[in-house]
Interface confidence: low
């Protein structure tokens, strides 16, 4: 109720002679701070004096503390909340009741705490789970109702007197609710731990034994079995007898049923501890064990591998891998059921024995086409030789072999011909499915492996084909060697290097870029007239009459090709000059007379000069000299001179006669 002081602390504290006691304690006074505190041992209230009698272990007043015996007792509290106490060391005669006499300014209170001090260290207490099963983790707990800051202790676990390797977790509690030290050990017991003694040992800080608690483990487990076989190696031949015996070495609780298993499957009507197998067959080879059950479950013995020996069975061949690519590696495996395993093998390729091959595996590092065929084998062990099985087929795949490009046309091939080529090969696996051609022209492929080139070009040089299955194999290119008429025929002037002047030495060359066949003939032609049959046409001294249009022809056995017409131009000074008169060389005075200077020149005359009978030059420089009106005095011989870039030429004299008109004659 509200008239009480409120205290919290453990009800009883436990310790032993020479140890210490730590008393966690809290309080709340009714009013104000604590002014006086006395710790009594077994206090008794004296009604006469209205005070408590008893041994005073500790006393403190507002005037100061009264020293206690060698400071054995310590008040670790304060004036309003904490009333924690420590007694160190604690003695056997400290057992009994401790009385905490508290006084504030107006209120008083006596709080009692029980102290149990034993003569010797008391033992801890081991707590076990209600049931322990093999291989299931359990927690073992060791509890001691003691803990004191001034007296360190340790709890150690032992199994059959030997410290346990598993790590234990130790915890302590020094609270107003409880005071204890606890050690917890996580442990997975095996069936072999059944009946074993577990100890929790209390030790001081130096590891000195103080006390202990022990328990015996009751580990529930399935039956533990041993199997014995006759003959002991469990190796027999067909027709022999075998006996197997099952012995129970441990079971908790007791076993209830027995059975036998072969390769994990229960054998019918075999429920005794002995299994008798008479006249065994190879099918009875396998792994045997006995199974015994109790309430925990079934226990199994180790397996006995019974080997019933027999001669090899007909063999089969496994190939890694077929089809195989030429050049790759292949492994053959001979598979034959036998016991003991075969020690020797005989291999056959297409029915013929393969010499030197006696292993289970045959490895061919580099497969070739001839390795294809049927592979079979025979296995042999100490009991006999097996039969040859059906064998396995090896398919060797390889690119097409010996591929050739063949020209089907009669030779030679001429430009413009239709050329047919075929792509041939010697062998192929898998079969050839397509062909490739180089270069890749947009050509016709009328059938598989045939190429048709219409209107073959003169520059089609080489063609190669490939036959393809999973791979393409290329033939060496074949030259078409297309024959054609000479190409790009043209006339080229070799000399002179500059323009041709009359009288020069001139050479013309007939050029062409190519011809197949190379043997050619030349023809030079001017205005339909054959001039020569050499590659050059030579003029020792060219004349204006040689000017004109020239062509050269080049021909071979395929055909002939003409050049474009080439014009030869000869430059010469004015020649064949003459003076012509119009209307004639006799003209009546008063009329008009025109003198023309006619010439032949290349380039044409650029400048004319006129002369009279006295070789006097006249002031006229055009081709025509016009006299109008003509006078009798104009009568006489005239000549002209023509000039071009090459030189000059002059005409002979031409005489003009001017006669009198009838009027003049009449006047005379």
């Amino acid at each position: 109720d509200s008239s009480k002081w409120v205290f919290e602390h453990p009800e009883t504290l436990y310790a032993w002679e020479g140890a210490c006691v730590w008393i966690p304690c809290t309080y709340r006074a009714l009013d104000g701070d604590l002014e006086s505190f006395i710790l009594f041992h077994n206090p008794e209230y004296n009604k006469n004096t209205s005070k408590f009698d008893g041994t005073r272990l500790y006393e403190s007043t507002k005037d100061g503390k009264v020293p206690s015996e060698q400071k054995r007792v310590q008040f670790l509290g304060d004036k309003n909340k904490n009333c924690t106490l420590s007694i160190h060391p604690v003695h056997l005669n400290d057992s009994g009741q401790l009385g905490l006499r508290m006084e504030s300014k107006t209120e008083k209170w006596m709080e009692r705490i029980h102290l149990n001090v034993s003569e010797r260290p008391f033992p801890p207490h081991i707590q076990l789970p209600p049931e322990i099963q093999e291989s299931q983790e359990v927690t073992l707990t060791c509890l001691l109702n003691f803990s004191c800051y001034g007296y360190p202790i340790q709890l150690q676990w032992l199994l059959e007197g030997v410290p346990m390797r598993q790590a234990a977790v130790t915890s302590t509690s020094l609270t107003i609710k409880s005071v204890f030290t606890r050690s917890e050990l996580k442990f997975s017991p095996q069936w072999s731990h059944h009946g074993k003694i577990v100890t929790c040992q209390l030790q001081d800080a130096d590891g000195k034994f103080l006390s202990n608690d022990t328990v015996q483990l009751n580990v529930k487990h399935t039956p533990k079995l041993e199997i014995k076989v006759t003959p002991s190696d469990a190796i027999v031949r067909e027709g022999d007898s075998v006996t197997m015996t099952c012995e129970v070495s441990s079971s908790n609780p007791e076993y209830t049923t027995v059975s036998w298993l072969k390769d994990g499957t229960s054998l019918k009507k075999q429920n005794t501890f002995t299994l008798n197998l008479r006249e065994v067959t190879k099918d009875q080879s396998g792994k045997y064990c006995c199974q015994v059950s109790n309430d925990v479950g079934p226990g199994r013995s180790e397996e006995v591998f019974l080997q019933v020996q027999y001669a090899p069975e007909p063999s089969t061949v496994q190939i890694l891998h077929s089809p195989a690519v030429e050049g790759s590696q292949v492994e053959f495996l001979c598979m034959s059921l036998a016991n003991p395993l075969p020690t020797n093998y005989t291999w056959y390729h297409n029915g013929k024995e393969m010499q030197g091959r006696t292993e289970e595996k045959v490895h061919i590092p580099k497969i070739l086409p001839w390795h294809a065929g049927t592979y079979s084998c025979v296995a042999e062990n100490i009991l006999g030789t097996g039969q040859r099985g059906p064998g396995a087929e090896l398919d060797v795949q390889y690119p097409p072999k010996k591929v050739t490009t063949v020209i089907q046309n009669p030779m030679p091939i001429r430009e413009g011909d239709t050329v047919t080529l075929s792509c041939n090969y010697n062998s192929s696996n898998p079969s050839v499915t397509r062909y490739e051609w180089k270069p890749h022209g947009a050509w016709e492929e009328p059938s598989l492996g045939v190429l048709k080139i219409q209107n073959v070009g003169w520059d089609n040089t080489t063609i190669a084909c490939a036959a393809c299955n999973s791979w393409c194999s290329w033939a060496s290119p074949v030259a078409l060697n297309v024959q054609y008429a000479p190409r790009d025929v043209r006339v080229r002037k070799i000399k002179p290097l500059s323009e041709i002047h009359s009288g020069n030495s001139v050479s013309l060359q007939c050029d062409f870029s190519s011809s197949h066949p190379k043997e050619v003939q030349f023809f030079w032609e001017k205005n339909g007239r054959l001039l020569g049959k050499e590659s050059q046409l030579n003029f020792d001294s060219i004349s204006p009459e040689d000017a004109g249009s020239y062509s050269c022809w080049v021909n071979n056995s395929i055909g002939q090709t003409a050049s474009k017409a080439w014009t030869l131009e000869v430059l010469y000074a004015p020649r064949r000059l003459r003076v012509s008169m119009s209307p004639g060389d006799q003209v009546m005075e008063g009329k008009s007379a025109t003198l023309t200077c006619e010439s032949d020149a290349n380039p044409p005359v650029s400048h004319y000069t006129w002369f009279d009978w006295n070789n006097q030059s006249l002031p006229y420089h055009s081709q025509k000299l016009r006299l109008e009106p003509v006078k009798v005095q104009h009568s006489g011989a005239y000549w002209c001179q023509g000039t071009n870039s090459v030189g000059k030429g002059r005409s002979p004299l031409s005489t003009l006669t001017v006669y009198y008109s009838p009027e003049t004659i009449g006047r005379r």
């Epitope: 890749h440 022209g441 947009a442 791979w471 290329w474 060496s476």
Partner: antibody, heavy 116, light 108 residues
Framework: QVQLVQSGAEVKKPGASVKVSCKAS????????ITWVRQAPGQCLEWMGW????????IYAQKLQGRVTMTTDTSTSTAYMELRSLRSDDTAVYYC?????????WGQGTLVTVSS | EIVLTQSPATLSVSPGERATLSCRAS??????LAWYQQKPGQAPRLLIY???TRATGIPARFSGSGSGTEFTLTISSLQSEDFAVYYC??????????FGCGTKVEIK
């Protein structure tokens, strides 16, 4: 003159796909095949495959079978190479090549980087 | 597949000197072998096809020889522009067309 112009550089994440184009000009596109070759940084040249622009026939390197597809579009004279399920070791310069026995013309190359 | 082995892996040569590169095939490839040149950051360039035929525009200092399983690329007088990696390639049996792993020709 003959020219092969390839698409630009690409950066891809592992597991993605890339499609490189190669536009041809200056010759009759269907008269030649297109070969694709790649070169990883500082490594050898690796032949990837070939396509006939004439009939679309393809031949692929066995190593890339199932991951690579080569196609052509004759209307635009363009060849394409698609590579799927990219891995970091597919990082390389990819070239297209006009295929002929006597001469060949290469594209400028396309750098494909595969990085997470 | 046909394996091509190139030797040496690296060849140190002075400009103007002759360089001889070797390529060995694991089985006969007839004369269906090509040689390529590759410079850093560039696509390979065809030098020789059919083991010995120069491709269009390839200088006469490059020559190829051999047939069957042994092949040689010879550069008669090395020019500065010839320092590169050289690969051989077979197209005899395919798929796959296979390449050698290259010979690096470097300046001595």
């Amino acid at each position: 003159q003959v020219q092969l112009v390839q698409s630009g550089a690409e950066v891809k994440k592992p597991g993605a796909s890339v499609k490189v184009s190669c536009k041809a000009s200056g010759y009759s596109f269907t008269s030649y095949g297109i070969t694709w070759v790649r070169q990883a940084p500082g490594q050898c040249l690796e032949w990837m495959g070939w396509i006939s622009a004439y009939n679309g026939n393809t031949i692929y390197a066995q190593k890339l079978q199932g991951r690579v597809t080569m196609t052509t579009d004759t209307s635009t004279s363009t060849a394409y190479m698609e590579l799927r399920s990219l891995r970091s070791d597919d990082t390389a310069v990819y070239y297209c090549v006009r295929d002929s026995n006597h001469e060949d013309f290469w594209g400028q190359g396309t750098l494909v980087t595969v990085s997470s | 597949e046909i394996v091509l082995t190139q030797s040496p892996a690296t060849l140190s040569v002075s400009p103007g000197e002759r360089a001889t590169l070797s390529c060995r095939a694991s089985q006969s490839v007839s004369s269906n072998l090509a040689w390529y040149q590759q410079k850093p950051g560039q696509a390979p360039r065809l030098l020789i096809y059919g083991a010995s035929t120069r491709a269009t525009g390839i200088p006469a200092r490059f020559s190829g020889s051999g047939s069957g399983t042994e092949f040689t690329l010879t550069i008669s007088s090395l020019q500065s522009e010839d320092f590169a990696v050289y690969y051989c390639q077979q197209y005899h049996t395919w798929p796959p067309v296979t390449f050698g792993c290259g010979t690096k020709v470097e300046i001595k």
